[in-house]
Amino acid sequence: DWVVAPISVPENGKGPFPQRLNQLKSNKDRDTKIFYSITGPGADSPPEGVFAVEKETGWLLLNKPLDREEIAKYELFGHAVSENGASVEDPMNISIIVTDQNDHKPKFTQDTFRGSVLEGVLPGTSVMQVTATDEDDAIYTYNGVVAYSIHSQEPKDPHDLMFTIHRSTGTISVISSGLDREKVPEYTLTIQATDMDGDGSTTTAVAVVEILDANDNAPMFDPQKYEAHVPENAVGHEVQRLTVTDLDAPNSPAWRATYLIMGGDDGDHFTITTHPESNQGILTTRKGLDFEAKNQHTLYVEVTNEAPFVLKLPTSTATIVVHVEDVNEAPVFVPPSKVVEVQEGIPTGEPVCVYTAEDPDKENQKISYRILRDPAGWLAMDPDSGQVTAVGTLDREDEQFVRNNIYEVMVLAMDNGSPPTTGTGTLLLTLIDVNDHGPVPEPRQITICNQSPVRQVLNITDKDLSPHTSPFQAQLTDDSDIYWTAEVNEEGDTVVLSLKKFLKQDTYDVHLSLSDHGNKEQLTVIRATVCDCHGHVETCPGPWKGG
């Protein structure tokens, strides 16, 4: 029959070439002379001339060694023609399969592979995967089947074999316990890929395993005991820098320290922060310390990390003895602001009050006093006793110096320390009103018509406070009552002035005496302009001119 079975040809054949592979034969050759030819890639088209055929015998020839990795299969067509060139058979399919030889070594996809794994992990933890390829066949043969192995490990601590590799997938896993970044931060593995499923050619590469940090080391105080000296009253004062060492990766959350005052700070006087670069604990005063109340504080500070510990670790504690240094403190007036009630107008030399300061220092220091600010100059202060006396007339109604009945004075106390310190106090004198002002009418000038005059209403004011004010009483004096009447309204806070007899146009003085509820009398002259007019007027009309 005009057929041929698939032909298998090993790659890399050594010849001699041309090498006879198979014979094409048409049974029509009994009747006529047959000439054979082949076509297709590898024959008459690229790659041309790999195969040929003996024209008269039909022997299929291989002209050169084959490379499976280049072309694994050739598909050719065989032709049979008679002497006159007529085709005697249909073209025949010729399949030539190139069989694999183990002519390629495995190749790793990288010279160096990099992976990482957390320190302290258990066996079985995957680290990384390495890959090698082999161009040879891995389907029908083992030529291209790669098996992975670890050839060596550096360093060999704590065990020779810390890692293993899956022979088929190239996945590297931890096999032994004891990965400790603080001892071995990186391992270098020489890995092998061997074809023939481990029995053939070998190639090597490097796998670098970085051991990642876990917070498996506690920060430790070094030293653990500190002594510090702090002046009393200083706020925000740096007391001490506490130093820790931590074996974990610097500047990582497993290394960065967190400080906590565990004890000894009952009054919440201290605070501690972490220095961002040095990792030191900076102990500072949150509030001023008081030497006189407590001259020594013993603090206990615990240190941990920003990151939680991955295992149970003992925490380190430091002891800081803080010695409070005495400072000459300023005298303090007690109270800082003193309110004293005093009658206005008391006689000169009359005592107002005693205002003294206390010195926080325990030594019996001498305190001297003086007035710092006395706007009206009404007071004096005894430098030894702190006795304040009147040297001027205290006037409640003095609007320049008195606000809301209060006269404010600032006093100073100075101790005899070296150097001396001063403290100030505020003396608030609440001036008690006395009936020292009579009632006054407003306005004091009026204009009124001499015909059908309008009543003039005058407001009464009194600088004093109740009860030294309304109700007021009015009385006309010096014969003013002949032409005028004066009556206080029902509320007692205004006076109504009326013209009761005709007066010619002119200016007149009306003598009005007003007295308050405390019978304090004030005589006031009202200047009344009388005009020739009817009813209401504001200014006298000029003389009438006809024309």
């Epitope: 302290g120 258990l122 079985g124 065990h159 096999i175 295992l311």
Partner: antibody, heavy 117, light 111 residues
Framework: EVQLLESGGGLVQPGGSLRLSCAAS????????MSWVRQAPGKGLEWVSA????????YYADSVKGRFTISRDNSKNTLYLQMNSLRAEDTAVYYC??????????WGQGTMVTVSS | QSALTQPASVSGSPGQSITISCTGT?????????VSWYQQHPGKAPKLILS???KRPSGVSNRFSGSKSGNTASLSISGLQAEDEADYYC???????????FGGGTKLTVL
């Protein structure tokens, strides 16, 4: 001599708790992962739990997850297994064993845990 | 159902040789050369007799040997002796959180 010695086994009612201990000597305890392996009466070996040398990493078999807790105190060279919510099927001899990097060696002599009402 | 498969029992006469197989998968026995074998006498703790397929710890008789082919490992005991009568367990490393697998055990009877 390398040695592991378990203790703490006994009879406990279902739902109860027990704490097993394993004292190690003769080797650098903190360098090795440790495991608990149990063997029910007449049955094979069953891996229960493991802990890394530092104690920072732990694994559990699905059958005990959430009920058992493995821990270690390297300063005392001691391994522990806290067993809570015990069931009848937890009845077994419990062995502690050191993982040598691909195999278990040595093993303790075992401690019997019986869960029964 | 154990992860690694062993015959439930084997037997042999004194002086004979026997082999116990341990079959796993391409992710345990087939993937790593970390197959170990343990001997356990009744009422006693398991004892390591082979590690890394065929390595004997000191003190273990050279009558015990191991091999591996593909996904199956084997323990061979030559010159059987009465004291060899015990249960034998194979074990393999595997990657993952259950990093060790045990076989169901094989009871060896010395006739």
């Amino acid at each position: 001599e390398v040695q592991l010695l378990e203790s703490g086994g006994g009879l406990v009612q279902p739902g109860g708790s027990l704490r097993l201990s394993c004292a190690a000597s003769g080797f650098t305890f903190s360098s090795y992962a440790m495991s608990w392996v149990r063997q029910a009466p007449g049955k094979g070996l069953e891996w229960v739990s493991a802990i890394s040398g530092s104690g920072g990493s732990t694994y559990y078999a699905d059958s005990v997850k959430g009920r058992f807790t493995i821990s270690r105190d390297n300063s005392k060279n001691t391994l522990y297994l806290q067993m809570n919510s015990l069931r009848a099927e937890d009845t077994a001899v419990y062995y502690c064993a050191s993982w040598g990097g691909g195999w278990f060696d040595p093993w303790g002599q075992g401690t019997m845990v019986t869960v029964s009402s | 159902q154990s992860a690694l498969t062993q015959p439930a029992s084997v037997s042999g006469s004194p002086g004979q040789s026997i082999t116990i197989s341990c079959t796993g998968t391409s992710n345990d026995v087939g993937a790593y050369n970390y197959v170990s074998w343990y001997q356990q006498h009744p009422g006693k703790a398991p004892k390591l007799i082979l590690s890394e397929v065929n390595k004997r710890p000191s003190g273990v008789s050279n009558r015990f040997s191991g091999s591996k082919s593909g996904n199956t490992a084997s323990l061979s005991i030559s010159g059987l002796q009465a004291e060899d009568e015990a249960d034998y367990y194979c074990s393999s490393f595997t990657s993952g959180k259950t990093f060790v697998l045990f076989g169901g055990g094989t009871k060896l009877t010395v006739l």
